[in-house]
Interface confidence: low
Amino acid sequence: QPDAINAAVTCCYNFTNRKISVQRLASYRRITSSKCPKEAVIFKTIVAKEICADPKQKWVQDSMDHLDKQTQTPKT
């Protein structure tokens, strides 16, 4: 789970070691602040839970790619 170190910066200190199904994911943010110890991706699940993940892992990249493509598909 991400920690807010102040109002502006949210950091990840540990990454999930479990792959999350893309069906459970709603969105993501890429955290790039040097105030944080790690470059990270924060996934938000469909139940609004935030999960820290390692952007170097292929499943994380695939999940971001999936969410990117999802936003290009008009909702009917």
């Epitope: 890429r30 790039t32 040097s34 990249q61 971001m64 990117d68 493509k69």
Partner: antibody
Framework: QSLEESGGDLVKPGASLTLTCTAS??????ICWVRQAPGKGLEWIAC????????TYYASWAKGRFTVSKTSSTTVTLQMTSLTAADTATYFC????????????WGPGTLVTVSS | ALVMTQTPSSVSAAVGGTVTINCQAS???????MAWYQQKPGQPPKLLIY???SLASGVPSHFRGSGSGTQFTLTISDLESDDAATYYC????????????FGGGTEVVVK
């Protein structure tokens, strides 16, 4: 907190040039390069991660001819090759915000003129 | 590439008036990753708005960003002479196409 670009010059077509962006603090976020031709709009070139990963991202048109590198804890360079008149512009370095999606701090810019 | 179409290219309004600048993205902007910048002659751009509607630190509240998806708007109300500048929108297209796209700019003239 500040950024400053240096290395802008008048060069001939086909030449190479390296620009440097210096940050006032060791602690910067991600550094990106953006250029602006005289009287024109802004054009993104590339970004590099300030963390140990040093991840790089390039505009599709810039791949191969432009190279962004982190040369020290406070400096980032932009190497440009095979310059043409179309590369004449003010080159800005900018720091991203807490996320990768916007630039919260800009340098004053350095002018590159490519002319024979 | 993410192409941002900004309109109008120039707009003139009186002090105290309101100006609206529109920006249309060629693709949906993920998570509303849209920013607005102000640039004055001889100066670098200055961040005004990020994530479509969040006001950057130190920016007066008469600047307002709105919109989502492909359509975004910057509204400047209670126009001041100091607001005379060129304004740029900038969208970020996310992981699968790491590109920033800038709009062509809108010159705001304050009468």
């Amino acid at each position: 907190q500040s950024l400053e670009e240096s290395g802008g010059d008048l060069v001939k077509p086909g030449a190479s040039l390296t620009l440097t962006c210096t940050a006032s603090e060791l602690d910067f976020y991600w550094i990106c390069w953006v250029r602006q031709a005289p009287g024109k709009g802004l054009e993104w070139i590339a970004c590099i991660g300030a963390g140990s990963s040093g991840s790089t991202y390039y505009a599709s048109w810039a791949k191969g001819r432009f190279t962004v590198s982190k040369t020290s804890s406070t400096t980032v360079t932009l190497q440009m090759t095979s310059l043409t008149a179309a590369d004449t512009a003010t080159y800005f370095c900018a720091r991203t915000g807490t996320e990768f999606t916007y630039y919260s701090l800009w340098g004053p810019g350095t002018l590159v003129t490519v002319s024979s | 590439a993410l192409v941002m179409t900004q309109t109008p290219s120039s707009v003139s309004a009186a002090v105290g008036g309101t100006v609206t600048i529109n920006c249309q993205a060629s693709q949906s902007v993920y998570n509303n990753n849209m920013a607005w910048y102000q640039q004055k002659p001889g100066q670098p751009p200055k961040l005004l708005i990020y994530t479509a509607s969040s006001l950057a630190s130190g920016v007066p509240s008469h600047f307002r960003g709105s919109g989502s998806g492909t359509q975004f708007t910057l509204t400047i109300s209670d126009l001041e002479s100091d607001d005379a500048a060129t304004y740029y929108c900038a969208g970020y297209k996310s992981y699968s196409n790491d590109e920033y796209g800038f709009g062509g700019g809108t010159e705001v003239v304050v009468k």
